[in-house]
């Protein structure tokens, strides 16, 4: 008995469907046993579906009822499943196991990793620190959603809407602005991007003079 998945990693967009491939080969014609799909995470393992060759009965894990379909050719050699309405919770490693009692009680397995793709949500831009000349401030940018994890980059424009170089690396977040001055004034755009989308937010920086203590 041999079991194989034709791909190691599959990528599919949230809300869509994906077929996790699994095929098996055996010389046995009188089949008694199971096809089982499990989802393996570091925190736990959970049953996706079990199919019994004898009873032809499917048993689905809670999160997969009405959302997972087993191939119509499960008896022939195709143990693939299709998962509908993908969510971020479906990210993980899936293991296809085929067990045949009549094949010397052999159990064979194969795995496929599923990456559910989600474009970045519109990032939140914020300023940490007081916008006073001479101070240091931090510009932060974060997308609540995005898979794979979004990459962040910054661009800076002066009051005349001309792009200007940033003194520190433009990728990553937060962006640290040291010893701010009127020269720092302008607006800053953070771009959040991954394989499936791009979003941005901007912040206006307008340093004010230190208050006079009389």
């Amino acid at each position: 008995l041999t079991v194989e998945t034709t791909q190691d990693i599959l990528r599919a967009a949230r809300g869509r469907s994906v077929t996790l491939p699994c095929t098996y080969n055996t010389y046995v014609s009188d089949r008694e046993g199971f096809i089982q799909w499990d989802k393996l995470l570091r925190s736990q393992t959970e049953r996706v579906v079990t199919w019994n060759f004898v009873t032809k009965k499917y048993i689905y894990g809670n999160r997969y009822e009405n959302r997972v379909r087993v191939s119509n050719d499960a008896e022939l050699s195709n143990a693939s499943i299709t998962i509908d309405q993908l969510t971020m919770d479906d990210n993980g490693t899936y293991e296809c196991s085929v067990s045949l009692m009549s094949d010397q009680d052999v159990n064979a397995k194969s795995r496929v990793r599923l990456l559910v793709l989600v474009p970045p949500s519109k990032p939140d831009c914020s300023i940490q620190g007081e916008m006073v000349i001479g101070n240091n401030i931090q510009l932060t940018c974060h997308s609540a959603e995005g898979s794979p994890s979004p990459q962040y980059s910054w661009k800076s424009y002066n009051a005349q809407n001309q792009q200007r170089p940033l003194t520190q690396p433009v990728s990553g977040e937060p962006l640290l602005l040291k010893n701010i001055s009127t020269e720092t004034a302008g607006y800053y755009i953070c771009t959040s991007s991954n394989d499936v989308g791009i979003e941005s937010c901007n912040i206006t920086v307008a340093p004010r003079p230190p208050s006079m203590n009389i």
Epitope: E46, T50, N52, I59, N62, K109
Partner: antibody, heavy 118, light 107 residues
Framework: QMQLVQSGGGLVKPGGSLRLSCAAS????????MNWVRQAPGKGLEWVSS????????YYADSVKGRFTISRDNAKNSLYLQMSSLRAEDTAVYYC???????????WGQGTLVTVSS | AIQLTQSPSSLSASVGDRVTITCRAS??????LNWYQHKPGKAPKLLIY???SLQSGVPSRFSGSGSGTDFTLTISSLQPEDFATYYC?????????FGQGTKLEIK
């Protein structure tokens, strides 16, 4: 004939360590997830730990997390449970059990007694 | 973790009686519920898997039913060798959990 033969139990002091072994034969050990289950004196069965067939996914009951480590050597057809920082409440008969698709815990070892006492 | 509650915790019955043991899960576990028989000094024995499938070699007087959160194990006609402790166990997800057990004694 499928068999799971256990060894390594015994008496150990609180805070001590012990390693249990489970030798498999009669089936393709490397294809099956394996588990440890225990039964304390006068108590019911308690699942302790599970390991995937290839040994890369390990799961533990909260009661043993951080103290017990499950491992396997597929070349030697052997399953292990390394127990450390042992407590009196870990006193139990420990069983290894094979987990098959559809039929979890279908074959069990004979059990080995671990006694934690000063 | 999913909790399993068995009832009754102990039961006295006679040879030939029909006996039912129930197991309730704290959340839905579909049909991923298994039943084991355990006798003192022996390893537990799998009787029923995925709620209602009889393990190979287990007498047909044992049967299981249920799905979601409520499950039952029925022994249609008790035999002398059936006096033991019975456990339900969920295999829907880790941590796998067992019920507290039902001790079946001779009346």
């Amino acid at each position: 004939q499928m068999q799971l033969v256990q060894s390594g139990g015994g008496l150990v002091k609180p805070g001590g360590s012990l390693r249990l072994s489970c030798a498999a034969s009669g089936f393709t050990f490397s294809s099956y997830n394996m588990n440890w289950v225990r039964q304390a004196p006068g108590k019911g069965l308690e699942w302790v730990s599970s390991i995937s067939s290839s040994g890369d996914f390990m799961y533990y009951a909260d009661s043993v997390k951080g103290r017990f480590t499950i491992s396997r050597d597929n070349a030697k057809n052997s399953l292990y449970l390394q127990m450390s920082s042992l407590r009196a409440e870990d006193t139990a008969v420990y069983y290894c059990a094979r987990e098959g698709p559809g039929t979890p815990f279908d074959y069990w070892g004979q059990g080995t007694l671990v006694t934690v006492s000063s | 973790a999913i909790q399993l509650t068995q009832s009754p915790s102990s039961l006295s019955a006679s040879v030939g009686d029909r006996v039912t043991i129930t197991c309730r899960a704290s959340q839905s576990i579909s049909s991923f519920l298994n039943w084991y028989q355990h006798k003192p000094g022996k390893a537990p024995k799998l009787l029923i898997y995925v709620a209602s499938s009889l393990q190979s070699g287990v007498p047909s007087r044992f049967s299981g039913s249920g799905s979601g959160t409520d499950f039952t194990l029925t022994i249609s006609s008790l035999q002398p060798e059936d006096f033991a402790t019975y456990y339900c166990q969920q295999s829907h997800n880790t941590p796998y959990t067992f019920g507290q057990g039902t001790k079946l004694e001779i009346k």
